[in-house]
């Protein structure tokens, strides 16, 4: 049998049943999430649920740049270090960098310091690039 791979929106890339869009525009975390949602299909800021997924995303982004952090869908809405994915995915895989997570930093970014394989917390009102994800 021929199994057709679902197609992603123009410019989005496909990996293991998901489509990803890397936006090289500056948005704060909440505006980035709203922009992701505006694409429908249940799109949100991206959850990253395995090392394989993280590696695929990191390789893709490194083709564009290697120094600008990127918002992902992990946040701490209660400001109690209780992190959760905005798309409702289980928070099992973790890839935090060794940086302190204190202060007013309740949104997560892919850090450029380790080729986008690790995360850092940052202030949610910071404007930076972002990564969206949906299941086609």
């Amino acid at each position: 049998d021929i199994i057709m791979r679902p197609s992603c929106a123009p410019g989005w890339f496909y990996h293991k049943s998901n489509c990803y869009g890397y936006f090289r525009k500056l948005r704060n975390w909440s505006d980035a999430e709203l922009e992701c949602q505006s694409y429908g299909n249940g799109a949100h800021l991206a959850s990253i649920l395995s090392l394989k997924e993280a590696s695929t995303i990191a390789e893709y982004i490194s083709g564009y740049q290697r120094s600008q952090p990127i918002w992902i869908g992990l946040h701490d809405p209660q400001k109690r270090q209780q992190w959760q994915w905005i798309d409702g995915a289980m928070y099992l895989y973790r890839s935090w960098s060794g940086k302190s997570m204190g202060g007013n930093k309740h949104c997560a970014e892919m850090s450029s310091n380790n080729n986008f394989l690790t995360w850092s917390s940052n202030e949610c009102n910071k404007r930076q690039h972002f990564l969206c994800k949906y299941r086609p």
Epitope: A9, P10, G11, W12, Y22, F23, R24, K25, Q65
Partner: antibody
Framework: EVQLLESGGGLVQPGGSLGLSCAAS????????MSWVRQAPGKGLEWVSA????????YYADSVKGRFTISRDNSKNTLYLQMNSLRAEDTAVYYC??????????????????WGRGTLVTVSS | FMLTQPHSVSESPGKTVTLSCTRS????????VQWYQQRPGSSPILVIF?????PSGVPDRFSGSIDSTSNSASLTISGLQSEDEGDYYC?????????FGGGTKLTVL
């Protein structure tokens, strides 16, 4: 007042070389990425090259890569474009331009809100 | 990829005109789009940056937008005036370079 003034244009034979300069004033030159954009007679705009504020990163259109070199001297507030192995299709008005940056990391990602008047380069035998 | 613009557009004074800029591949939404106006014999002028932002000094008759469905950007000019006549270029980014559209000649009848 922010100003950019290009110079160095002229007539050159195919295969020849020419150097353009762009004198900047009215802003902190070293803080801004700079671009060269050209326009062939009766044609549209074509981005040629860009350089970061420090001069450490440079970018080129495929059509000029390996032939043109962009550089800057921040002590003189001047941008340069050295053009070698010139071809007839390089004939154009060359504009120097700069502006804000939507993403400071990407030096080629700067919109161009200040333009010079341009200098005409004619490549012909 | 390419940015495709209609070669020419004509409209009467006082009317509203919308100029389009379609990206041939990749998403128009991923990178900022700028619009430049070039009057005959003059250097280009930035009229819209970062998709929909207007530089100071540009009238609010000029507005920019992005439509991911049609994969295109638009420049809308309302209350068209004779001084709006000229060429309009969209511009975005591709990897390490800037890309301009071919331009649209706007004629105010």
């Amino acid at each position: 007042e922010v100003q950019l003034l290009e110079s160095g244009g002229g007539l050159v034979q195919p295969g020849g070389s020419l150097g353009l300069s762009c004198a900047a004033s009215g802003f902190t030159f070293s803080s801004y990425a700079m671009s060269w954009v050209r326009q062939a007679p009766g044609k549209g705009l074509e981005w040629v090259s860009a350089i970061s504020g420090s001069g450490g990163s440079t970018y080129y259109a495929d059509s000029v890569k390996g032939r043109f070199t962009i550089s800057r001297d921040n002590s003189k507030n001047t941008l340069y474009l050295q053009m070698n192995s010139l071809r007839a299709e390089d004939t154009a008005v060359y504009y120097c331009a700069t502006g804000g940056s939507g993403s400071p990391v990407y030096y080629y990602y700067h919109y161009l809100d200040v333009w010079g008047r341009g200098t005409l380069v004619t490549v012909s035998s | 990829f390419m940015l495709t613009q209609p070669h020419s557009v004509s409209e009467s004074p006082g009317k509203t005109v919308t100029l389009s800029c379609t990206r041939s591949s990749g998403s128009i939404s991923f990178d900022y789009v700028q619009w430049y106006q070039q009057r005959p014999g003059s250097s280009p002028i930035l009229v819209i940056f970062e998709d929909d932002q207007r530089p100071s000094g540009v009238p609010d008759r000029f507005s920019g937008s992005i439509d991911s469905t049609s994969n295109s950007a638009s420049l809308t000019i309302s209350g068209l005036q004779s001084e709006d006549e000229g060429d309009y270029y969209c511009q975005t980014y591709d990897d390490n370079r800037q890309v301009f559209g071919g331009g649209t000649k706007l004629t105010v009848l």
